[in-house]
């Protein structure tokens, strides 16, 4: 009788499998920044090192009694979820505990920073195999805590953080809001978001994926073989830390970008009921529940992409939104989305040597999101070709003119504020293969890439009748790299990618006004990587 | 993800001359002060002074020492609780909030963040 959470995240074919690094030893080390832990618990004894690190605030209240089993409860449970002999995700993994939370589960940003620095020092003094840092804690947004996570991540450490239990936007909390950490929300046995009293799991664009976090069986500090169930995004993060430890145990050279992309790609999709989240957060929150991915040897050189949403631009006339990929990822396309439909489009530009996706609000708009499609493309060479807006009535064409470069995405940015004078941009695969086509007043940006064996094609789907959205999916074996909405309705909200699905959103009023002849078209650019083939555009 | 969401950033506009010291007057505060948007989670009196990324080891210590010296001139005792070298240049200090204006004008300071609570999730 295996606990539900392990059954959920570890597919049947993995259940009995031992993860070992190529040389036979499991060298992954997980650092847990939490409460003190009961190292003698049978679930974790012999595999946990309780460091002498202790940086916690005093407990509140004069009548507070320090009871060892209560002080150790949170950390012991998480240590058990990560590497417990029976109820652990990564059963053989060695764990180091740092005490940054007191007996009431409270810590400080400064204590957490000193803990992260302790890990960095340990790494410098005695370099070891892959390191995973589990941060099952959250405070208000902290620029310095996020910066420290970024610095540590850039040394090759993989950080996994709880999204937070505040039933709120995870971007308002740290370290959950740090882009370099893998941020985990919590789901229950029915794959639904976890409710915790009046609160529950955090959500939003800062969450990377969800994992089991309700009624999780794990080591109890009440006795050395006791178990108990606990709930929260800490438990969810511990599952993902365990999965990451297992992935690194098999393949110690996997990078943070590869780990994140694989976690996303192999997660269970579309099982979460998004209605639990506030309406404005539903589109931003990933509908993904973590599972242990197969090794890269079993899955070959797939093209892996994820969608990264920017922060909301805000409503000012010239407000811009910026979405960034991780340093190792390629920005293959950029689109934009506005709930009011008042946006002036999107484009890709280089900032500090990195390509970023930008979107611009329009006059009277409530703000926009920039939506980046970030992909792992080995040995890629990508560039942006843009053409300024054409004169009235003329089309603007941009294609990839370099040899062996293929079109992975199109962006369009309108110079004019007046939404009524412009038509939406167009992208037509039949007439102009591999071209971005913009109508009057639109600057057009083509994202062009060369990589061994990269091939792409356009897939379109149009709906003439009333519809809030039009979708088009890339077929199996192909990965969505670009997503645009083509002319039809007088007002579209924009386009974005959800996994391998391109979603074009239409304004309600536009639906009502539209004549049947004006189809709204979702245009997807689908690519695949076939290392043996040459880069090509598929007709 | 890293844009400052619900976060308080204050530019402390303070007299540049303070006590007429030439080196202080020369350095106009461009650094910002930040604190948690949730008041109950703040820890006033403890601050993380974050220095520019390229700040050298010796300069970190000098900046902390300079803050102590200048605070002492004003009759304040401050305590440097920790110096950060390995992840980012900076230091943790226990001091009166009266000294924030002074601290923000120190060379190499990028921003100062008030300490705050984190919680088990």
């Amino acid at each position: 009788s295996i606990p539900w959470n392990l059954e959920r995240i570890i597919p049947a074919w993995h259940q009995t499998e031992e993860d070992r690094s190529p040389d036979g030893s499991s060298q992954v080390e997980v650092y847990l920044l939490d409460t003190s832990i009961q190292g003698a618990h049978r679930e974790i004894e012999g595999r946990v090192t309780i460091t002498d690190f202790n940086s916690v605030p005093e407990e509140d209240g004069t009548r507070f009694h320090r009871q060892a089993s209560k002080c150790d409860s949170h950390g012991t449970h998480l240590a058990g979820v990560v590497s417990g002999r029976d109820a652990g995700v990564a059963k053989g993994t060695s764990l180091h505990s740092l005490r940054v939370l007191n007996c009431q589960g409270k810590g400080t940003v400064s204590g957490t920073l000193i803990g992260l620095e302790f890990i960095r020092k340990s790494q410098l003094i005695q370099p070891s195999g892959p390191l995973v840092v589990l941060l099952p804690l959250a405070g208000g947004y902290s620029r310095i805590l996020n910066a420290a996570c970024r610095h540590l991540a850039r040394t090759g450490v993989v950080l996994v953080a709880a999204a937070g239990n505040f039933r709120d936007d995870a971007c308002l909390y740290s370290p959950a809001s740090a882009p370099e950490v893998i941020t985990v929300g919590a789901t229950n046995a029915q794959d639904q978001p976890v409710t915790l009293g009046t609160l529950g799991t955090n959500f939003g664009r800062c969450v990377d994926l969800f994992a089991p976090g309700k009624d999780i069986i794990g080591a109890s500090s009440d006795c050395s073989t006791c178990f108990m169930s606990q709930s929260g995004t800490s438990q969810a993060a511990a599952h993902v830390a365990g999965i990451v430890a297992r992935m690194l145990s098999r393949e110690p050279t996997l990078t943070l970008a590869e780990l994140r992309q694989r976690l996303i790609h192999f997660s269970t999709k579309d099982v979460i009921n998004m209605a639990w989240f506030p309406e404005d957060q539903q589109v931003l929150t990933p509908n993904l529940v973590a599972t242990l991915p197969p090794s890269t040897h079993e899955t070959g050189g797939q093209l892996l992409c994820r969608t990264v949403w920017s922060a909301h631009s805000g409503p000012t006339r010239t407000a811009t939104a910026t979405a960034r990929c991780a340093p190792e990822e390629e920005l293959l396309s950029c689109s934009s989305f506005s709930r009011s439909g008042r946006r002036r489009g999107d484009w890709i530009e280089a900032i500090g040597g990195q390509q970023v996706c930008k979107a611009l609000n329009a006059f009277g708009g409530e703000g926009v999101y920039a939506v980046a499609r970030c992909c792992l493309v080995p040995r890629a060479n990508c560039s942006i070709h843009n053409t300024p807006a054409a004169r009235a009535g003329l089309e603007t064409h941009v294609h990839c003119h370099q040899k062996d470069h293929v079109l992975t995405g199109c962006s369009f940015h309108w110079e004019v504020e007046d939404l009524s004078v412009r038509r939406q941009p167009a992208l037509r695969s039949r007439r102009q293969p591999g071209q971005c086509v913009g109508h009057q007043a639109a600057s057009v940006y083509a994202s062009c890439c060369h990589a061994p064996g990269l091939e792409c094609k356009i897939k379109e789907h149009g709906i003439s009748g009333p519809s809030e959205q039009v979708t088009v999916a890339c077929e199996a074996g192909w990965t969505l790299t670009g997503c645009n909405v083509l002319p039809g309705a007088s007002l579209t909200l924009g386009a974005y990618s959800v996994d391998n699905l391109c979603v074009a959103r239409v304004h309600d009023t536009a639906r009502a006004d539209r004549t049947s002849g004006e189809a709204t078209v979702a245009a997807a650019i689908c690519c695949r990587s076939r290392p043996s083939a040459k880069a090509s555009w598929v007709q | 993800q890293d844009e400052d969401g619900d976060y308080e950033e204050l530019m402390l506009a303070l007299p540049s001359q303070e006590d007429g010291l030439a080196d202080e007057a020369a350095h106009v505060a461009t650094a910002t002060f930040r604190r948690c948007s949730k008041e109950a989670w703040r820890l006033p009196g403890t601050y993380i002074v974050v220095l520019m990324e390229e700040t050298q080891r010796l300069q970190i210590e000098q900046t902390a020492h300079r803050l102590q010296t200048r605070a002492a001139r004003r009759g304040y005792v401050i305590k440097v609780l920790h110096i950060f070298y390995d992840l980012f240049p900076g230091f943790l200090v226990k001091m009166s909030s009266d000294l924030l204006g002074l601290a923000l004008k120190l060379p190499h300071v990028e921003y100062i963040e008030e300490d705050s609570f984190v919680f088990a999730q």
């Epitope: 009788s1 606990p3 003698a40 618990h41 049978r42 679930e43 417990g84 002999r85 029976d86 109820a87 069986i217 109890s220 009440d222 006795c223 050395s224 073989t225 006791c226 178990f227 | -």
Partner: antibody, heavy 118, light 108 residues
Framework: QVQLLESGGGLVQPGGSLRLSCKAS????????FSWVRQAPGKGLEWIGY????????KYNQKFQGKATISRDNSKNTLYLQMNSLRAEDTAVYYC???????????WGQGTLVTVSS | EIVLTQSPATLSLSPGERATITCRAS??????LNWYQQKPGQAPRLLIY???NRATGIPARFSGSGSGTDFTLTISSLEPEDFAVYYC??????????FGGGTKVEIK
């Protein structure tokens, strides 16, 4: 080899008390904890409590809290079970057993019979 | 408090037959369950620890399996000396040591 030898059993009046002893030999006494377990005639095993000889820390089954007291004398490699206010239902064979907390009871004494009767 | 339920209460078998005793825990206990044998007039003896490991000197015909909440003690071929009472046991927080009610294996 490891040996545990109980003594002190016999006939006790209702309301009376008794002290059972368990002498250990064949290993380092303070390295293991000890449990006292009893078995009423024809019934199953019932755990009373344990002691860690190293620290002297004890833990009891709530049913025996205040009725049983476990102690030890490290110099004599002996542990004790003091039982007060005995009643007829306390009639049982009392065993001491060696353990590591969270592990099995790997060695048992032969048991000593306590009969509570007037 | 964890409750251990053993079944059957009595098992009537002949020598050479296979005996299977189950123990169900009311809560998850991982693999931290032990089995004991007690013959009339003797102290219990540890047979299996941590669900599946044979204690020192225990013959190979005794085996344990299971984890979580469901456990099994199997005697592959009963010898005359195996007719006895068998108990399962776990650790918990309150009380720390919990025994099952016992299963009597008797000669048919």
């Amino acid at each position: 080899q490891v040996q545990l030898l109980e003594s002190g059993g016999g006939l006790v009046q209702p309301g009376g008390s008794l002290r059972l002893s368990c002498k250990a030999s064949g290993y380092t006494f303070s390295s293991y904890s000890f449990s006292w377990v009893r078995q009423a005639p024809g019934k199953g095993l019932e755990w009373i409590g344990y002691i860690d000889p190293g620290s002297g820390g004890t833990k009891y089954n709530q049913k025996f809290q205040g009725k049983a007291t476990i102690s030890r004398d490290n110099s004599k490699n002996t542990l004790y079970l003091q039982m007060n206010s005995l009643r007829a239902e306390d009639t049982a064979v009392y065993y001491c057993a060696r353990q590591r907390v969270g592990y099995s009871l790997d060695y048992w004494g032969q048991g000593t019979l306590v009969t509570v009767s007037s | 408090e964890i409750v251990l339920t053993q079944s059957p209460a009595t098992l009537s078998l002949s020598p050479g037959e296979r005996a299977t005793i189950t123990c169900r825990a009311s809560q998850y206990v991982g693999s931290y369950l032990n089995w004991y044998q007690q013959k009339p007039g003797q102290a219990p003896r540890l047979l299996i620890y941590d669900a599946s490991n044979r204690a020192t000197g225990i013959p190979a015909r005794f085996s344990g399996s299971g984890s979580g909440t469901d456990f099994t003690l199997t005697i592959s071929s009963l010898e005359p000396e195996d007719f006895a009472v068998y108990y399962c046991q776990v650790w918990d927080s309150s009380p720390p040591v919990v025994f099952g009610g016992g299963t009597k294996v008797e000669i048919k």
